[in-house]
């Protein structure tokens, strides 16, 4: 016969799970802030840049009170997946000038991927319905010039910073309701 069954698996404390997710999100927010500052130092922005393919900011700070955990986690995961795709695109197609932001951009990508896995785990631990697999997103066109890569980087890091800031606030608020 096989080995004796182990002790029954204790369901982890969802507040502790949420805590570790908040820590990861905070850490990624700090990384993003630092990389955005590095980008500004090397390539000062010549405008307030945005990119149509980026997700719109999920929620204003004032509307945080109405949030529900499933909705927040599902939306956060979808938005961060989009940012992961954009960071990958930036590293691949952003041009030689953005190579000066390595290895930090690579580290950011790895930590973003780690946070996404943590969110997936949290959703399954909380027995939240798993969202359907994302439809394949249309490929992002490469920037038309070196300046295009720089402006895209400003847009992506700026948007990711706002999203993560929103995520930290939202997750902390939801923790108090668990």
């Amino acid at each position: 016969p096989g080995p004796p069954p182990g002790p029954p698996r204790v369901s982890p404390d969802p507040r502790a799970e949420l805590d570790s997710t908040v820590l990861l999100t905070r850490s990624l927010l700090a990384d993003t802030r630092q990389l955005a500052a590095q980008l500004r130092d090397k390539f000062p922005a010549d405008g307030d840049h945005n990119l149509d393919s980026l997700p719109t900011l999920a929620m204003s700070a004032g509307a945080l009170g109405a949030l529900q955990l499933p909705g927040v986690l599902t939306r956060l995961r979808a938005d961060l997946l989009s940012y992961l795709r954009h960071v990958q695109w930036l590293r691949r197609a952003g041009g030689s000038s953005l190579k000066t932001l390595e290895p930090e951009l690579g580290t950011l990508q790895a930590r973003l991927d780690r946070l996404l896995r943590r969110l997936q785990l949290l959703m399954s631990r909380l027995a939240l319905p798993q969202p359907p697999p994302d439809p394949p997103a249309p490929p992002l066109a490469p920037p038309s010039s070196a300046w295009g890569g720089i402006r895209a980087a400003h847009a992506i890091l700026g948007g990711l910073h706002l999203t993560l800031d929103w995520a930290v606030r939202g997750l902390l608020l939801l923790k108090t309701r668990l």
């Epitope: 390539f43 010549d46 000038s97």
Partner: antibody
Framework: EVKLLESGGGLVQPGGSLKLSCAAS????????MSWVRQAPGKGLEWIGQ????????NYTPSLKDKFIISRDNAKNTLYLQMSEVRSEDTALYYC??????????WGQGTSVTVSS | DIVLTQSPASLAVSLGQRATISCRAS??????????MHWYQQKPGQPPKLLIY???NLESGIPARFSGSGSRTDFTLTINPVEADDVATYYC?????????FGSGTKLEIK
Amino acid sequence: EVKLLESGGGLVQPGGSLKLSCAASGFDFRRYWMSWVRQAPGKGLEWIGQINPDSSMINYTPSLKDKFIISRDNAKNTLYLQMSEVRSEDTALYYCATYGHHATDSWGQGTSVTVSS
Amino acid sequence: DIVLTQSPASLAVSLGQRATISCRASESVDSYGNSFMHWYQQKPGQPPKLLIYRASNLESGIPARFSGSGSRTDFTLTINPVEADDVATYYCQQSNEDPFTFGSGTKLEIK
């Protein structure tokens, strides 16, 4: 107040070289893109090129790329334009300028370069 | 390179009237939520002075008589009403792509 003071211009023979300088003051030089723009007598403005704060990205107008070299020394708050193989069509007033959130928003008074034998 | 075509080459306007200068780009200068078209004024013996940045933003210290509009390839600088001090040459410039380029200039005179 932003101040940009170009120097180094003068008379140079065809085929010769010249190095222009632009001394910057009144702002944090190391946080700005810097540009060179020239203007031939009685003509319009021609963008020469630009350099980012840490010199990792330098762009030129293609026709001048092999003749001109843009550089900067952040410790000295100075922008440079090294000109080589000059010809009569390089006779112009050479301006240095900042480039940033408000486009090319500060210009020097210019330094005059005359190419003649 | 992006070619900027300015028109007219020269313009004579009565004091108090409206002056309109056009700048057409050979390809779009819009990207990342901005129109990278700027307008400068240059008086004889002086360096250029920024009037309008990114198509429609008035530079600090510039009178509200100056305004800019347009997107993609077609842009306009309007001066209304024209004053004697506005006699100058006006240039458009695109900074969407390297090399940045200038229009050929429009000389404004008083009728």
